[in-house]
């Protein structure tokens, strides 16, 4: 959705959210390009790219929240995802460097599309919260009450360690989006009914 515009149609909004989460759990859109660009596409290195426990809420946690709590948690988590993605972007090779080293510029473009896509999802989460009459969520274009602080890895000057941390974060992000998609898939046909 464009900035600030909200559909009042529950089924349409839910459909958009489901479509967005389907795309965002696809590793070919984010994790795989990141692995290639950062030179981690080697079996031994891939082994080190595991999700850090506790970095994202589990599916079980999400299911136990109820709709409003789920949307609030999703909104807050996406807020810090935006920061982590921006942080990763800062340390990516520049386009000209990629070309010189023969790496695929399309991979960089995929990575740079991640943040706007997360923003689009977050806007729809806000819209769904409005539809469910949840007035306790910050409008996406206004300042929030502060982004909940993530269990951020201690900033490291070790370039390789930073790459692995980025890889672990993205793996966790895709898993989280898969969990979010599964929760949305259980939502009912109307704002008042849920298939549990």
């Amino acid at each position: 959705a464009a900035m600030g515009s909200c559909s009042k149609e529950y089924r349409m909004l839910l459909g958009q959210l489901q479509k967005q989460t389907d795309l965002m759990q696809d590793t070919s859109r984010l994790l795989d390009p990141y692995i290639r660009i950062q030179g981690l596409d080697i079996p031994k290195l891939r082994e080190h790219c595991r999700e850090s426990p506790g970095a994202f809420p589990s599916e079980e946690t999400l299911r136990g929240l109820g709709r409003r709590g789920f949307l609030q948690t999703l909104n807050a988590t996406l807020g810090r995802v935006l920061h982590r993605l921006a942080d990763l972007e800062q340390h990516l090779p520049k386009a000209q460097d990629l070309e010189r080293s023969g790496l695929n510029i399309e991979d960089l473009e995929k990575l740079q599309m991640a943040r706007p896509n997360v923003l689009g999802l977050r806007n729809n989460v806000y819209c769904m919260a409005q539809l469910l009459d949840n007035s306790d969520m910050t409008e996406p274009t206004k300042a929030g009450r502060g982004t909940p602080q993530p269990p951020t890895p201690t900033p490291t000057s070790d370039v390789f360690q930073r790459k692995l941390e980025g890889c672990s974060f993205l793996r966790g992000y895709h898993r989280f989006m898969h969990s979010v998609g599964r929760v949305f898939s259980k939502w009912g046909e109307s704002p008042n009914r849920s298939r549990r």
Epitope: A1, A2, M3, G79, L82, H83, R84, L85, A86, D87, E89, Q90, Q112, M113, R115, P116, N117, L119, G120, R122, P140, T141, K142, A143, G144, R145, G146, T147, P148, Q149, P150, T152
Partner: antibody
Framework: EVQLVESGGGLVQPGGSLRLSCAAS????????MSWVRQAPGKGLEWVAT????????YYLDNVRGRFTISRDNAKNSLYLQMNSLRAEDTAVYYC??????????????WGSGTLVTVSS | DIVMTQSPDSLAVSLGERATINCRAS??????????MHWYQQKPGQPPKVLIY???NLESGVPDRFSGSGSGTDFTLTISSLQAEDVAVYYC?????????FGGGTKVEIK
């Protein structure tokens, strides 16, 4: 009234250090990401650095990364810019600015009046 | 880094006439339905002031003679009827990715 007031500018020799401060008032400081933007005499505007609302994330212009450090103290409603290894090309008026809008895609809606940093021998 | 090219460098317009300033990005600053482009006004000795955010949204308190349009790489700031108090330098800013970059500025004067 929403206000940002910078201080700490002055004349410093190349290679020297300076710490700029920005005092915020009239709004809930801890709710906002904050930035430093600079303007060399007679020139245009240049974004320098941004820090997230809670201070966990920082973003820098390439040619200041490693030399400048942005930080904040939410309890004191203050933003800082520690500038080390200063160069002549860092000479500018440094503005403190409040970030609003979409997370990580901000724009600046409130600016301080600026503090002049002159790097010269 | 995304390079923002503003044109013209300076502009002299009669009072009451339309002033148009253009900003071109070296790559798209739009994505997923968002336009990450903003416009600022700076008067001598003053800090910049936001006029338009996200390409076309008028900042609160800014006269409605100011408007913004565009998407992708090409954006426009329009002053529909220039007033004496609009004499200033105008800057575009993108926030699509880090580093955020400003255009070089357009100086608007009265003809």
């Amino acid at each position: 009234e929403v206000q940002l007031v910078e201080s700490g500018g002055g004349l410093v020799q190349p290679g020297g250090s300076l710490r700029l401060s920005c005092a915020a008032s009239g709004f809930t400081f801890s709710n906002y990401a904050m930035s430093w933007v600079r303007q060399a005499p007679g020139k245009g505007l240049e974004w320098v650095a941004t820090i997230s609302d809670g201070g966990s994330f920082t973003y820098y212009l390439d040619n200041v990364r490693g030399r400048f450090t942005i930080s904040r103290d939410n309890a004191k409603n203050s933003l800082y810019l520690q500038m080390n290894s200063l160069r002549a090309e860092d000479t500018a008026v440094y503005y403190c600015a409040r970030d609003v809008g979409h997370t990580t895609f901000w724009y600046f809606d409130v600016w301080g009046s600026g503090t002049l940093v002159t790097v010269s021998s | 880094d995304i390079v923002m090219t503003q044109s013209p460098d300076s502009l002299a317009v009669s009072l009451g006439e339309r002033a148009t300033i253009n900003c071109r990005a070296s790559k798209s600053v739009s994505a997923a339905g968002y336009n990450f482009m903003h416009w600022y006004q700076q008067k001598p000795g003053q800090p910049p002031k936001v006029l338009i955010y996200y390409a076309s949204n008028l900042e609160s308190g800014v006269p409605d003679r100011f408007s913004g349009s565009g998407s992708g790489t090409d954006f426009t700031l329009t002053i529909s009827s220039l007033q004496a108090e609009d004499v200033a330098v105008y800057y575009c800013l993108h926030s699509r990715e880090f580093p955020f970059t400003f255009g070089g500025g357009t100086k608007v004067e009265i003809k």
